[in-house]
Amino acid sequence: GSGIFQLRLQEFVNQRGMLANGQSCEPGCRTFFRICLKHFQATFSEGPCTFGNVSTPVLGTNSFVVRDKNSGSGRNPLQLPFNFTWPGTFSLNIQAWHTPGDDLRPETSPGNSLISQIIIQGSLAVGKIWRTDEQNDTLTRLSYSYRVICSDNYYGESCSRLCKKRDDHFGHYECQPDGSLSCLPGWTGKYCDQPICLSGCHEQNGYCSKPDECICRPGWQGRLCNECIPHNGCRHGTCSIPWQCACDEGWGGLFCDQDLNYCTHHSPCKNGSTCSNSGPKGYTCTCLPGYTGEHCELGLSKCASNPCRNGGSCKDQENSYHCLCPPGYYGQHCEHSTLTCADSPCFNGGSCRERNQGSSYACECPPNFTGSNCEKKVDRCTSNPCANGGQCQNRGPSRTCRCRPGFTGTHCELHISDCARSPCAHGGTCHDLENGPVCTCPAGFSGRRCEVRITHDACASGPCFNGATCYTGLSPNNFVCNCPYGFVGSRCEFPVGLPPSFPWVA
């Protein structure tokens, strides 16, 4: 049923042991009760007990107190279960009877006699609180209390709301006092049958079948299914949608496995040198002072930067250098002088000039003398100033370099290039090769020096693909495609590094 009407009999008083008809019971009134519960009637009438009825065994003789009893015969409070929405109103008839017969089943005995009866009509809300009452007539008194409570799994003001807690495929919830569902932790939805996925799990790309789970849909990965899975074999690329392979900066090819930026990815240049993505190996290192080698891996002397001043000599040490100062100078770089102009430090007629508010000095030397104190006679060729085998010649206060053929410049440091004469006409690009200069001609020109104007421009049709540069006059076909990095073929039509399934890969 959906609820139970409970009636607790507490005390019955029939001191004179009288029946309703005025006769007395012999030897005393052996009393049992009949209870009839029905729908509310303004005037109680005979007829079926629509809400239920119940009888008790003999509970006592004449006057007695009724004890609570939870089970078996003579249970108290009496239970009147019902299986409908409690209407909130009722009629109750309690009859006290005397039986000469069986104690346990007096209802069936012949010769039962009515002692007294009471009728209650009214309203009663569902609740745990007992309503206590007492009814008297001329001969008897009955004390009792009653209430209506909902059966297990029924809730609400009229016990009409069925709720049975569960934790299975059909739901995961407990029941609130009003019968509404209270989802167990990790579950949601009207019937608490939808799991709450791991916090942050992507709404579209992830799902779960139990709480705190995040199962990724195809093409997605990561704890929260918010990272796309790139194309299988994608080496140096990313995706914004599944199965993409968008190359990282400096990488190319279908699978982003072609290194277009050797500098960034391999850092071949050491010791703070600058790397540029050019040259025969795909990169060139420009060394900082003090370093040399293809990768600037070889440390020149720490003294290469000439840190010692005032004629100090430099000595390499493990991670640094040490300046051995000439007499009269001191400090880490021989930058401080012991003497001032007042000590007449300049030789050979040198004139002394004070520096740093008189704390140091500088000697201005006459011609042909040098050194911080004008102590050295000048030989302008001792430093071998002429490069590339040039001959040094002292010419009074100056010197000149006589250069070998093919070289020029004050120190013979400049190579005279075949291209220096600009042999290429019409804006052609000159390349110095061992056998002489070669011209690469712009579109519309050909010939060894780009001197021939082509009436039919082979590059005009745009025969080169993938951003390649078209040149004419270098081949019998009248054009050559200079491919950008990452493409090959006579027209630069094939990407490098295609998978073997492509027919043009050997």
Partner: nanobody, 119 residues
């Protein structure tokens, strides 16, 4: 040839004082300056203090305010060292800056005197 002889080194407690003296002898050309260098164990020789003929004094940063250099005459120099610290420990070399016939400047050095400052 110039000879330089130092004296006054020794062991002293931190906070104590020492006075170093140096005298030049021999075939003395023009001396332009005299002074003291220190060489701590495992380190390079570094200037402590120097004074020129024109009375120009120079001090290392670590010596300023604690050490005083003075030329008693053209051939002698003294270094008064007060409030000594353990980091002042080392061999103290007297030097003189003099001219040669060439002409150029040259340093002449003494044998050195040990100064040890204990903490």
């Amino acid at each position: 040839e110039v000879q330089l002889v130092e004296s006054g080194g020794g062991l002293v407690q931190a906070g104590g004082s020492l006075r170093l003296s140096c005298a030049a002898s021999g075939d003395i050309p023009r001396i332009a300056a005299m002074g003291w260098y220190r060489q701590a164990p495992g380190k390079q020789r570094e200037l402590v203090a120097t004074v020129s003929n024109a009375a120009t004094t120079r001090y290392a940063d670590s010596a300023k305010g604690r050490f005083t250099i003075s030329r008693d005459n053209a051939k002698t120099v003294s270094l008064q060292m007060d409030n000594l610290k353990p980091e002042d420990t080392g061999v103290y070399y007297c030097y003189s800056l003099a001219t040669t016939v060439t002409p150029s400047w040259v340093n002449y050095w003494g044998q050195g005197t040990q100064v040890t400052v204990s903490s």
